[in-house]
């Protein structure tokens, strides 16, 4: 059986939309499937790599690599999206290309970044972990770390940094899929909202779905002990 909830929820574009949340009900009137997984049920994607889930994550990453920061022209906010999802008239799509990007490193201004921009994250303004020396962030936003400390400045003069961010990574469903959403939408969908991250590639949704002890490598499920838990 299914339990359907419908509600008006604030979405990425800053408008309220009617959203459906469909929950598979437990046949035995017990905990939900997500709760059962958290409690240690024999759920194979938490025990070993699942090809379907792996392909889903790779597909999400490929899309994200090509994303940019969509900044609303009315200063109502910004969100990481694909160019096609960013209004040409009501917003500005900030995407580095050709030689418009910032330098890869302060010691070589000539080599420009082409991957980005990312809403609220920039290698020039991140103090921790700083992109410098032997630890220059790659020219691939899906390999960027989470920035834990920004340079102290109210305004940077960069469109993608001075806007009010409207969406962050949200882990939805038992498949460990990730979407950049508003907090409201994420909570309504019973997802896990990552306040600290800017990109889906920075979070490991399956690790969150599985719970219990974190994977040794967040990319590789290793909870073999589930076989004895349930």
């Amino acid at each position: 059986a299914q339990h359907v909830t419908t509600q008006l929820v604030l979405r990425n574009k800053g408008v309220y939309e009617s959203v459906k949340y469909i929950q598979q009900e437990n046949f035995w009137i017990g905990p939900s499937s997500i709760d059962l997984i958290h409690l240690g049920a024999k759920f194979s994607p938490c025990i070993r790599k699942d090809q379907q889930i792996e392909q889903l994550v790779l597909r999400e990453r490929d899309l994200e690599r090509d994303s940019g920061c969509c900044v609303q022209n009315d200063h109502s906010g910004c969100i990481q999206t694909q160019r096609k999802d960013c209004s040409e008239t009501l917003a500005t799509f900030v995407k580095w290309q050709d030689d418009t990007g910032p330098p890869m490193d302060k010691s070589d201004l000539g080599q420009k970044r082409t991957s980005g921009a990312v809403c609220h994250q920039d290698p020039r303004t991140c103090e921790e972990p700083a992109s410098s020396g032997a630890h220059i962030w790659p020219d691939d936003i899906t390999k960027w770390p989470i920035c834990t400390e920004q340079a102290k400045s109210n305004r940077t003069g960069f469109l993608h940094m001075d806007c009010q961010i409207k969406g962050r990574p949200c882990c939805i469903s038992t498949k460990g899929s990730c979407e950049i959403t508003t907090r409201e939408y994420c909570e309504f969908m019973h997802g896990y909202f990552h306040e600290e991250a800017t990109l889906c590639s920075q979070v490991h949704c399956l690790d969150k779905v599985c719970g219990l002890l974190p994977f040794l490598n967040p990319e590789v499920p290793d909870q073999f002990y589930r076989l004895w838990l349930s």
Epitope: D99, T100, K106, S107, D108, L109, K112, R124, T125
Partner: antibody
Amino acid sequence: QVTLKESGPGILQPSQTLSLTCSFSGFSLTTFAMGIGWVRQPSGKGLEWLAHIWWDGEKYNNPVLKSRLTISKDTSKNQVFLRIANVDTPDTATYYCARISSIYYIIDNWGQGTSVTVSS
Amino acid sequence: DIVLTQSPATLSVTPGHSVSLSCRASQSISNNLHWYQKKSHESPRLLIKYVSQSISGIPSRFSGSGSGTDFTLSINSVETEDFGMYFCQQSYNWPLTFGAGTKLELK
């Protein structure tokens, strides 16, 4: 308030080493993205970027003068130093120290400049 | 090194008139172009960053435009305090380079 002040010998002879000091206040060279650079302007000519040093100790010297330039800092004293070895008459110029940022690569504050004459 | 060519070398203007100063780069520098003003016996002062971004404390009569290799600094209704030298600077690559300057003088 950010201030930078250059000091130097004023006059020196060819083949000598020019030693310049930039004393600054209102900010720290330990702050992320902060840098101090040296720019010179020979009389009636354009500005020339010489060298700079970053908050993390990384340095840059203009390749045209590279072998003659040495830049260093003393963060505890809020000072940056520039040495130009084996000077000659074309090194006669006004030398400025300038604050730069690795976020923008613009000079947001300049010193008043110090005049240096190389003459025998 | 990237060469910046400024024109004209000297511009004579009457207060109240508007002027345009040109800066041309020897190669494309995208939007990595900034403008400075230098008055006699004073240090240079940043006017415009990244082609057209305003700097706090700089009067709104100063504006910038252009991209790639051709850039313009415009002064709408020149005031007596605006006379002096104007330099452009590129930050596309090391070493940072400057134009030779345009001297704005009283006509």
